[in-house]
């Protein structure tokens, strides 16, 4: 028999154990996890509990902002005896359980981090069988998502309509970088078409390369800038390019 009492935060604490000594409820999380925007991060969370061989139904929950009341970003439920925690909620489909709750591990994986993901995250486990019990981390883990300086991931010259050529530049960064083209012809930079940004990547197109020479794509955000160039040399008399 294990007697419990609630602490001020509503968590159940093991206060007295008769017969075999049991573990107390506790949760171990790091104070902080750092990751770069666009990458993935793991929010570690392990726990101990007083229910020696609990094999009943359980629910694992992660919430953001504040404990007990913050919005849930992830929730999964494991059936009695099962090591599989079936996902019931994964905000924007970016949260996945890495740990195994049956092995006291609630570690969470967050994909494609954005600056807005920065903040505190709190893990919680609920035993919903005979041993009706629950526990949530009070201090949580702070996720610090750092911005990413621009990086040009692709620059290329492609055939365009009527034997013309066009240039594409794709860059990534967080915040998403602004792209600009410059080239040998006057007004080239103003002709750049800013394409759709996808995630942390932005593409700009220079629709018509009217002169031979060097075309430079510049990507810039608050953390810095990056440049890359392509060269267009047409062999006059025959359509072709050297880049």
């Amino acid at each position: 028999l294990v007697k419990t009492r609630r602490d001020a935060s509503g968590d159940l604490l093991n206060t007295e154990a008769h017969s075999a000594p049991a573990q107390r409820w506790s949760m171990q999380v790091p104070a902080e996890v750092n990751a770069e925007a666009g990458d993935a991060a793991v929010l570690p969370c392990t726990f101990t509990h007083p229910h020696r061989h609990y094999d009943g139904p359980l629910t694992a929950i992660w919430r953001s902002g504040e404990p007990y009341a913050g919005p849930q970003v992830f929730r999964c439920t494991a059936a009695p005896g099962s090591e599989l925690c079936q996902t019931a909620l994964s905000l924007h489909g970016r949260f996945r359980l890495l740990g195994n709750p049956r092995r006291n591990d609630l570690s969470l994986r967050v994909e494609r981090l954005a600056l807005a993901d920065s903040g505190r995250y709190f893990c919680r486990v609920e035993f919903t069988g005979d041993a009706h019990d629950r526990y949530e981390s009070r201090h949580g883990v702070r996720l610090r998502v750092t911005a990413a300086a621009p990086r040009i991931v692709n620059i290329s010259v492609l055939p365009g309509p009527a034997h013309a050529f066009r240039a594409l530049c794709t860059a990534e960064g967080e915040p998403p970088p602004a792209l600009a083209w410059s080239g040998p012809a006057p007004g080239n930079s103003s002709a750049a078409l800013q394409g759709q940004g996808h995630g942390y990547q932005v593409t700009a197109e220079l629709p018509a390369l009217t002169r031979d020479g060097r075309y430079t794509c510049t990507a810039a955000n608050s953390l810095g800038r990056a440049e890359a160039s392509v060269y267009l040399f047409r062999f006059h008399g025959a359509p072709g390019t050297s880049t």
């Epitope: 990458d39 993935a40 599989l84 996945r96 890495l98 195994n100 092995r103 990534e172 990547q201």
Partner: antibody, heavy 122, light 111 residues
Framework: QVQLVQSGGGLVQPGRSLRLSCAAS????????MHWVRQAPGKGLEWVSG????????GYADSVKGRFTISRDNAKNSLYLQMNSLRAEDTALYYC???????????????WGQGTMVTVSS | QSALTQPASVSGSPGQSITLSCTGT?????????VSWYQQHPGTAPKLMIY???NRPSGVSDRFSGSKSGNTASLTISGLQAEDEADYYC???????????FGTGTKVTVL
């Protein structure tokens, strides 16, 4: 429809290089990790390399580390494997495969290319 | 790292159920719920049948199901059919580097 079309295999001498390409279509290429998996004649599957959606994270099997380089060009919906210092034991059918997730390491491979044979022999 | 262990061959009669095993360690199958199963017919590319232990991609028959206990994952094929005759490979995420390990493969024969 969703497909991966491979090119670039062939017969090469030990110590030489080869570049494999994989052209993707029918899905948003830059949403997913991509992988190379190989299968030696009459043998099982071996994961070779993986690359995350934005090339931010890359992994290699120990057997190819330092010799092979994976890369992707999201603007061209293409995946590449540059193979240098090839050895006889690299002889295999090489498959490119699409992952289910943006990160390559916790992944499964739901779309596969047709495979391209690489034979390393003198 | 070592490949996951699978039986070399398993056979069954049409309509029967068979179960393929995939045994790993506490660093891979036992530690994580990231086990996948692939079917490969001769001369063709592998096909994903199960991911994350028990999830079926769309288009895969519900005769295929996955489960896991301890360090062993299982693929069950119920109502065995002639077209199920193929090689089957399991794969798992592992805490070592590199993060993937495949199984040795099982040849399924429909008698």
């Amino acid at each position: 429809q969703v497909q991966l079309v491979q090119s670039g295999g062939g017969l090469v001498q030990p110590g030489r290089s080869l570049r494999l390409s994989c052209a993707a279509s029918g899905f948003t290429f830059d949403d997913y990790a991509m992988h190379w998996v190989r299968q030696a004649p009459g043998k099982g599957l071996e994961w070779v390399s993986g690359i995350s959606w934005n090339s931010g994270s890359i992994g290699y099997a120990d057997s190819v580390k330092g010799r092979f380089t994976i890369s992707r060009d999201n603007a061209k919906n293409s995946l590449y494997l540059q193979m240098n210092s090839l050895r006889a034991e690299d002889t295999a059918l090489y498959y490119c495969a699409k992952g289910l997730w943006p990160s390559y390491d916790l992944d499964a491979f739901d779309i596969w290319g047709q495979g391209t044979m690489v034979t390393v022999s003198s | 790292q070592s490949a996951l262990t699978q039986p070399a061959s398993v056979s069954g009669s049409p309509g029967q159920s068979i179960t393929l095993s995939c045994t790993g360690t506490s660093s891979d199958v036992g530690a994580y719920n990231f086990v996948s199963w692939y079917q490969q017919h001769p001369g063709t590319a592998p096909k994903l049948m199960i991911y994350e232990v028990s999830n079926r991609p769309s288009g895969v028959s519900d005769r295929f199901s996955g489960s896991k206990s301890g360090n062993t994952a299982s693929l069950t094929i119920s109502g065995l059919q002639a077209e199920d005759e193929a090689d089957y490979y399991c794969s798992s995420y592992t805490s070592t580097i590199p993060p993937f390990v495949f199984g040795t493969g099982t040849k399924v024969t429909v008698l």
